[in-house]
């Protein structure tokens, strides 16, 4: 069910329209649901979820991660800096979400939904941000070559990459959700 169309909304006609913050919150939770479904298929298909050899594949990846300097943690919290980090991070994740598109059999639609919902989330957040100039968009040429490189990996590394992308994206979204609720 797309965000904003669950049974709770239908059953409560007196409910106020969703605020921008509520819409963003709901969108993140919707994407997290999708990630959960994708992780289930990944973990059922291989033993990557219990593997301790993650460092081998992590070297090839430059997945966005929240750090204290990004202004999203309570210590040194800065709403605008944090918002820029969240949007920049999501834009950087897009190439990895593109990589995931051909990685699932039974959850192909779910992978597409995660990708499309993330694009919508970025739009919501861009409306909220004041300092759009500070947001750096990834270079398409660099992304294209990264995608080619990831797709050329052997099967084991591709499985590991899929697992790491899902795990890191989940963590990034959770950190974002936490910070956005403090705004």
């Amino acid at each position: 069910v797309p965000p904003g169309e669950d049974s709770k909304d239908v059953a409560a006609p007196h409910r106020q329209p969703l605020t921008s913050s509520e819409r963003i919150d709901k969108q993140i939770r919707y994407i997290l649901d999708g990630i959960s479904a994708l992780r289930k298929e990944t973990c059922n298909k291989s033993n990557m979820c219990e593997s301790s050899k993650e460092a081998l594949a992590e070297n090839n990846l430059n997945l966005p991660k929240m750090a204290e300097k990004d202004g999203c943690f309570q210590s040194g919290f800065n709403e605008e800096t944090c918002l820029v980090k969240i949007i920049t991070g999501l834009l950087e994740f897009e190439v990895y979400l593109e990589y995931l598109q051909n990685r699932f059999e039974s959850s192909e639609e779910q992978a597409r939904a995660v990708q499309m919902s993330t694009k919508v989330l970025i739009q919501f957040l861009q409306k909220k941000a004041k300092n759009l100039d500070a947001i750096t968009t990834p270079d398409p040429t660099t992304n294209a070559s990264l995608l080619t490189k990831l797709q050329a990996q052997n099967q084991w590394l591709q499985d590991m990459t899929t697992h790491l992308i899902l795990r890191s994206f989940k963590e990034f979204l959770q950190s974002s959700l936490r910070a956005l609720r403090q705004m």
Partner: antibody
Framework: QVTLKESGPTLVKPTQTLTLTCSFS??????????VGWVRQPPGKALEWLAF???????YYSPSLESRLTITKDTSKNQVVLTMTNMDPVDTATYYC??????????????WGQGTLVT | DIQMTQSPSSLSAFVGDGVTMTCWAS??????LNWYHQRPGEAPELLVF???NLQIGVPSRFRGSGSETYFTLTINSLQPEDSGTYFC?????????FGGGTKLEI
Amino acid sequence: QVTLKESGPTLVKPTQTLTLTCSFSGFSLSTSGVGVGWVRQPPGKALEWLAFIFWDDDKYYSPSLESRLTITKDTSKNQVVLTMTNMDPVDTATYYCARSADDYLYYSFDTWGQGTLVT
Amino acid sequence: DIQMTQSPSSLSAFVGDGVTMTCWASQSINDYLNWYHQRPGEAPELLVFAASNLQIGVPSRFRGSGSETYFTLTINSLQPEDSGTYFCQSGHSFPLTFGGGTKLEI
């Protein structure tokens, strides 16, 4: 099976520093979405949230007690430590540590320690 | 900070009865509301998270509902072990806040 247990002094003199340790098992504090919080309850009164630490070391404190509190974690030892400076008789309470773990960060405490009474 | 107000502060009922208690938030907290039950001398126990989701192992006679600023916890067919104090808690953002509690006597 998830368990948490608080340990520390039962008696503290005014102006002293209280150090409480929460030892846990059955989960990892390096898993995203997981956090450990401290809550206290003076005799016969309501619950009061004190502090919270996340998997990524982000920390939050009760605004009224922030200047007196410090929360830290040792992921390898499966421990969370709370220190509270300048103790006062009004701080007499049962101190609980509790786990929060869900994808959407509802900050619901699904497992609690037995609590330790500090006078 | 978000303030949580519970009502009534105490109530008594008989085994088999049904009761409803309420919790108000001073501002909208979406569905980020949790309910706990505490028996004397024991640690609190999570009953309901996210306003209406029953925690695993909690009997179906418990039901949470509400959103934004108004929430209720309903217990049908009361049992002797349901006595104690019920607390609501906002889980929307920090600082986390608890209500003052509703003491239930069976």
